[in-house]
């Protein structure tokens, strides 16, 4: 039942308290734990107008809003150096590789007609190479790079016309790649698409301050996801036998005073208004959280009873993103009697309590380093060890059903509003070099060891 997550902050005795002996756990992850790593197409592919690719809203946003960035052409050039990415994956020894398909690389204007042959060939080659290496592909259909033509013609995700167009695109991907893909993600972190794309203007398309637009976009993203899930479930799952979800991202927050009921309410409200916004319709009762409906009654779209039924249960697992994009900006927290916290274990416990202990894939996790840091990324190792320790505790001590972990990211690349000022890769890439060699950082060696040992050995 929605609202159970509040027990996390009130330190309900049912929630395993973190005592000193549990600050670090030397143990292994479950047998067959799913270890992986991820990238987003726009962040690493480069070649933003090569071989017939159409422009995306982010290509446009870079040229209009990020004055110091020439284009994503800098990037890590994964479109050109696919073999180097595969070598990097081999080096780490992952069970899966999570990547996204660039919608405008397949369909330059977004509409599903004849696919761009070079784009199709690129993804097909990548999938074949992964299958050959026994690396499971987890494929994201939409990681923010909406074809610019759809933004210009329809107003992007504000227009519910996009729902059917997205479903057509998904259908094509299922038809062409579904024989090799067992895990699909429809949309990566829709909260950021809606909130920063249409609220703060920090993300493409860079629209600002229109609360109604923010919630219309969120509504259409949820409906698009649901439509694609039903499409896959009915027409593709019977013979492809795969799983499909949506990656939902969140921060975590702690009350200034854990004994203060109002502070705890505000923490719950904070989680509900970010994660619950999308999780409640999909993983919960099919509707927006009640608190949001009360708070936003005249700007929050309504789900009909039929739509609630349609939305509910449209994810085969809970794909969860916990990374820096959901922790920026930070400047409003103090006013609310709360502090942001990087406690992934508690966030996982909240999901367990709110959404009836779902199977969870951590679909994005990691931190960042300054762009000047090359291969000695000690901070990244510290953060990774901390996050992985929390995941292990969540599994072993709290009986949370985490079945996989996605380290983010395979490569240094374009980091959205931060462009190239930060790095998130386990492999260092010199963006100014011609060959864009992938050099393993200390974190890559560390993650490789974790995977090899399936956890932390004494």
């Amino acid at each position: 039942f929605s609202g159970d997550g509040r027990a996390i902050w009130s330190k309900n005795p049912n929630f395993t308290p973190v005592n000193e002996s549990q600050l670090f756990l030397y143990d292994t992850f479950p047998k067959n734990f799913f270890w992986g790593i991820g990238t987003g197409a726009l962040q690493v592919e480069g070649s933003w107008k090569k071989d017939g690719k159409g422009p995306s809203i982010w290509d446009h946003f870079i040229h209009t809003h990020l004055k110091n960035v020439s284009s994503t052409n800098g990037s890590s050039d994964s479109y050109i150096f696919l073999e180097k990415d595969l070598s990097a994956l081999d080096f780490i020894g992952v069970s899966f590789y999570q990547f996204s398909i660039s919608w405008p690389r397949l369909f330059p204007d977004g509409i599903v007609t004849v696919a761009n042959a070079k784009g199709l060939q690129y993804y097909s080659t990548l999938l074949d190479a992964l299958v050959l290496r026994n690396i499971e592909p987890i494929v994201t259909l939409y990681h923010w790079d909406l074809p610019l033509a759809l933004q210009e013609k329809y107003g992007g995700w504000k227009n519910d016309t996009i729902i059917d167009i997205f479903n057509d695109y998904a259908t094509y991907c299922f038809q062409m790649f579904g024989d090799r893909v067992k895990y699909w993600i429809t949309i990566h972190n829709p909260y950021l698409v809606a909130w920063h794309g249409y609220g703060t203007g920090m993300h493409a398309p860079g629209e600002k301050g229109n609360l109604a637009a923010v919630y219309t976009v969120g509504h259409n993203l949820i409906k698009a996801h649901s439509k694609v899930w039903h499409n896959y479930n009915t027409h593709f799952r019977p013979h492809q036998k795969g799983w499909l979800s949506i990656t939902l991202g969140s921060h975590w927050i702690e009350p200034n005073r854990s004994e203060n009921t109002m502070d705890i309410f505000k923490c719950q409200q904070s989680m509900v208004s970010v994660l619950g916004w999308f999780a409640n319709p999909i993983h919960g009762d099919g509707d927006y959280p009640e608190g949001m409906r009360k708070k936003l009654f005249s700007v929050l779209p309504i789900f009909s009873e039929a739509e609630k039924h349609e939305m509910r249960g449209t994810a085969d697992f809970f794909a969860f993103s916990f990374g820096p994009n959901n922790f920026k900006p930070l400047n409003t927290m103090a006013k609310m009697g709360q502090n942001v916290s990087l406690n992934l274990r508690e966030a996982l416990n909240w999901i367990k309590l709110e959404y009836n202990n779902p199977r969870i894939l951590i679909a994005e996790n990691g931190w960042f380093t300054d762009s000047r840091v090359k291969t000695e990324d000690t901070t990244a190792i510290y953060m990774m060890k901390n996050f992985l320790s929390q995941v292990l505790q969540a599994i072993r001590l709290d009986e949370i059903r985490v079945f996989g972990y996605t380290a983010w990211s395979l490569l240094d690349g374009f980091e959205w509003q931060d462009a190239y000022t930060i790095r998130r890769g386990l492999f260092y890439v010199d963006f100014n070099s011609k060959q864009k060699e992938r050099k393993p950082k200390s974190s890559a060696h560390y993650y490789k060891q974790i995977i090899r040992e399936n956890g932390f050995s004494l």
């Epitope: 929605s2 609360l211 309410f265 904070s270 970010v274 708070k295 936003l296 700007v299």
Partner: antibody
């Protein structure tokens, strides 16, 4: 500046109809929920109806349900109240008001509803035979 | 429907002195989901349209002087004016918005003695 201007009031016989309008200016009308509130002569405020930003949802006070219809035309930045089967007790000054939300764009979406932060000057409806 | 009862009906005040208006609800306005109390206060000055003073129990609307404050629990609420000024005269209304239909209190008329 942000402004709401009501019009359409007047004297009407019981059982007849009247349509009130509220013209909005100085803000993005299509992003806000809107209310009608009325005030009978010498009496207090009575909430009448609300409409969602896109017209998709509406609620009414029991006293007007089935007789009054709230609507909007976002292309014209105008809110309407269609009043049918008017009664003597509907005599009042009718105000339109904007629903405002706290814009917390600098961080996460915490929403503190502002209430009705902008009101029109009102238009008078007199129902009398 | 939720009934809001305001007291007193009329409140004669002396400039510079404090004033207090009470509003009682027939049911709780505390939302058990998010901990917020859905009560607002409005002021209608003579010959003018109403204006928002306080929203969600205790948050002052933009431009409202800090001499105004709202407080209360689930069913009992108070609007306080720490030092009344001549411009504060008018009718004060509480309003609930925890459920439809939204309802107003009957109003409290504040006038200078």
């Amino acid at each position: 500046q942000v402004q709401l201007v009501e019009s359409g009031g007047g004297v009407v016989q019981p059982g007849r109809s009247l349509r009130l309008s509220c013209a909005a200016s100085g803000f993005n009308f299509s992003s806000y929920g809107m209310h009608w509130v009325r005030q009978a002569p010498g009496k207090g405020l009575e909430w009448v109806a609300v409409i969602w930003y896109d017209g998709s949802n509406k609620y009414y006070a029991d006293s007007v349900k089935g007789r009054f219809t709230i609507s909007r035309d976002n292309s014209k930045n105008t809110l309407y109240l269609q009043m049918n089967s008017l009664r003597a007790e509907d005599t009042a000054v009718f105000y339109c008001a904007r629903d405002q939300y706290f814009d917390f764009w600098s961080g996460y979406p915490f929403f503190y509803y502002y209430g009705m932060d902008v009101w029109g000057q009102g238009t008078t409806v007199t129902v009398s035979s | 429907d939720i009934v809001l009862t305001q007291t007193p009906l009329s409140l004669p005040v002396t400039p510079g002195e404090p004033a207090s208006i009470s509003c009682r609800s027939s049911q709780s306005l505390l939302d058990s989901d998010d901990g917020d109390t859905y009560l607002d206060w409005y002021l209608q000055k003579p010959g003018q349209s109403p204006q928002l003073l306080i929203y969600t129990l205790s948050y002052r609307a933009s431009g409202v002087p800090d001499r105004f404050s709202g407080s209360g629990s689930g069913t009992d609420f108070t609007l306080k004016i720490s030092r009344v000024e001549a411009e504060d005269v008018g009718v004060y209304y509480c309003m609930q918005r925890i459920e439809f239909p939204l309802t107003f209190g009957g109003g409290t008329k504040v006038e200078i003695k």
